[in-house]
Amino acid sequence: AVDLTLLANLRLTDPQRFFLTCVSGEAGAGRGSDAWGPPLLLEKDDRIVRTPPGPPLRLARNGSHQVTLRGFSKPSDLVGVFSCVGGAGARRTRVIYVHNSPGAHLLPDKVTHTVNKGDTAVLSARVHKEKQTDVIWKSNGSYFYTLDWHEAQDGRFLLQLPNVQPPSSGIYSATYLEASPLGSAFFRLIVRGCGAGRWGPGCTKECPGCLHGGVCHDHDGECVCPPGFTGTRCEQACREGRFGQSCQEQCPGISGCRGLTFCLPDPYGCSCGSGWRGSQCQEACAPGHFGADCRLQCQCQNGGTCDRFSGCVCPSGWHGVHCEKSDRIPQILNMASELEFNLETMPRINCAAAGNPFPVRGSIELRKPDGTVLLSTKAIVEPEKTTAEFEVPRLVLADSGFWECRVSTSGGQDSRRFKVNVKVPPVPLAAPRLLTKQSRQLVVSPLVSFSGDGPISTVRLHYRPQDSTMDWSTIVVDPSENVTLMNLRPKTGYSVRVQLSRPGEGGEGAWGPPTLMTTDCPEPLLQPWLEGWHVEGTDRLRVSWSLPLVPGPLVGDGFLLRLWDGTRGQERRENVSSPQARTALLTGLTPGTHYQLDVQLYHCTLLGPASPPAHVLLPPSGPPAPRHLHAQALSDSEIQLTWKHPEALPGPISKYVVEVQVAGGAGDPLWIDVDRPEETSTIIRGLNASTRYLFRMRASIQGLGDWSNTVEESTLGNGLQAEGPVQESRAAEEGLDQ
């Protein structure tokens, strides 16, 4: 069962001092959204017992495993049902506390009633303030039964529930017809899913025989021990003032557990702490009584004394619950209350006993849950005890449950039950995940979801080349870390599988499904060097390089040229996809820019060493375009072009370039230089008659500038075919003067 306790402080003189605390002994409980799951929840449950709305209650978290509810302002705030929810996943458990008003008309003789399936439950409401009206019983907030006020027996109204079944569980209340619901007696009925002493899906399994008022859980057969007791069968008392499944918690305050109600997971319910009783858990046990609610009687024999917290304290020479067993009677010693083994293992179980006469090998036996009796294979006899060793046949899941070691001698007999948990080794449900790869290594995330039982103690990664029949290589890793598989072959597929283990012998699970992981190509090792470069324009650069000569095939798929523009902080990458290439033309560069240039060989996604860098300065871009270009036919073979100089020139123009093209023609255009840059007019000669031509021009300073607009003009007449255009130029002013 989940180690969850709801504590109610019942010192009710001042409701503002009232508090409820939920304490979890589960590992990592209440931490919220981390790996341990949801936090502890503590709240008032208004679904069944509704009370008038009041100020909101205050919830305070104290560390990771405790939560406290405060802020009660008036007694009516306390009345009703409170619940604490803790544990994660399938172990999520709700613990319920029902609070009754001490001033109610009717009070429960006993709040929590835990009964077995098929039993008769009797709820008893004691008259505290009499009213001569009907008494209405409700179940989970709905009408259930009516009693005439004359039907009270010894000042009590009884509700008999014969042959109860699990759906009968819930909150019951008894209310006088004309009274406020806050004056009701509230009860909690818990109906175990099985008959007395049985548990399991078909109620076929036998309970371990819980001691000291512990209640056998109908789902898992574990004893839910009263506060103040521990052990598989609740056989051991905690020190005074301690509680929790391992006695690890301590009652707050100087008066220990006085005035506290303890609520534990069903089917236990609620009770006072060990040594206390009464509706407010403030009365110490009467002599001869002990335990939670003082329900247990000591009946100590042989001079034993009754301790109200732990029961009989036996004098030397005696032991047993009532000090009824002489130390001469054989006694099982130091038997673990719980053992864990892995499925299909054949463990050895030891059982030690002492007594007079001394136990021998044949007097100690081991009984499995199905009733099979095992006899010991060997015994170690020491002066103070005999230890029998049992070789257990291969374990199956059905072996989970309560085993019993029994010793019998002529002096008497003793037995000790202990729980055996058969765990299923974990088996991965998925393949491991590839995180990164290189040519000779793979980085893998090995921990995947798994079937079977945790915790995971080790993770083994098995790998070998795909389609290989060689032995698997194995690496053992920490469950929480990623694994690097080293010294692999490049460009090779590897089959990779995970094997998980849990603690203990035989904890290794089956291998998980395989996955294919492929290493990268080998890194290219050759370093090219730059042979040279040639500027082919303000934005074009031709680069050439070489590689060292080495024997064997070239490891590479191509080259990567990188140009770094340090001024702008920009990198240009050019991919040359042939490993045979030794030259490349880079276009679209920025004129006037200083570039750092290098080249690298690449293979798959891997880059080899870069060449030593070269520094290249591209010439700046040319001047702006000439303005107002105009064409005028002079004859059947001549056209005059006029223009204006470009504006905002960065320097003196060295020449103009005119482009001549026959309109609609398919041939290349003709470029004609105008070498006298001061001129603004030129005559293009040698043109064909009656032919339409396109013209545009640009200036040059250190580099060619932008093209002007294109103009069209046709030559005159129908003269002879010319040899081709030529140019004659003069200043525009001269032409105008003429």
Epitope: T146, D148, P181
Partner: antibody, heavy 127, light 110 residues
Amino acid sequence: EVQLLESGGGLVQPGGSLRLSCAASGFTFSRYKMKWVRQAPGKGLEWVSVIYPSGGGTGYADSVKGRFTISRDNSKNTLYLQMNSLRAEDTAVYYCARVNYYDSSGYGPIAPGLDYWGQGTLVTVSS
Amino acid sequence: QSVLTQPDSVSGSPGESITISCTGSSRDVGGYNYVSWYQQHPGKAPKLLLYDVTYRPSGISGRFSGSKSGDTASLTISGLRTEDEADYYCSSSIGTRTYVFGSGTKVTVL
């Protein structure tokens, strides 16, 4: 579905006896308080008798006290009204009804109401 | 036991509101004793309309409402409809084992 079915009515002479039955189904009869209510021809409703779930507590209208006896058999889910020393003024349609208790607001007391009625059985007392 | 006093008849036109009174004493209506109201159509069994003076069981129209002042309880039917034409009875308890009905009121929809 909750059903109440009265039977046993008929013509009887003054001073005679009659036993009415009310068969209940569709609910846990043994948990509910039950009542008999009658209605004389052309007149209003008149409460006759009440019985608690256990059968231990009963009550009667003054007009029938000492002559009528209410009882129940929870194992048979049946309510009875034994009518002795019948008079002409006992002529009426006799209804059995279930008492339910309602939780009006959740904060206040619970309140009763006759939530299911039978179709009635006619008792005629005449010579 | 004395019968609770109701008017013999009350009438109203469709859509109107009508109120039926039910007068008792401090032993019944005026005490902390639960008043309930029932509707009975001719030839049919009665049907619970209101319990604890003002509360409607599920399935009962919100047109029916109740109130109480002193020894008198009242049933109001708003937005009167033709199907509301029936006899109406109030009821109360006297102690735990004694009960009383009203004399009944015939409601006519004009």
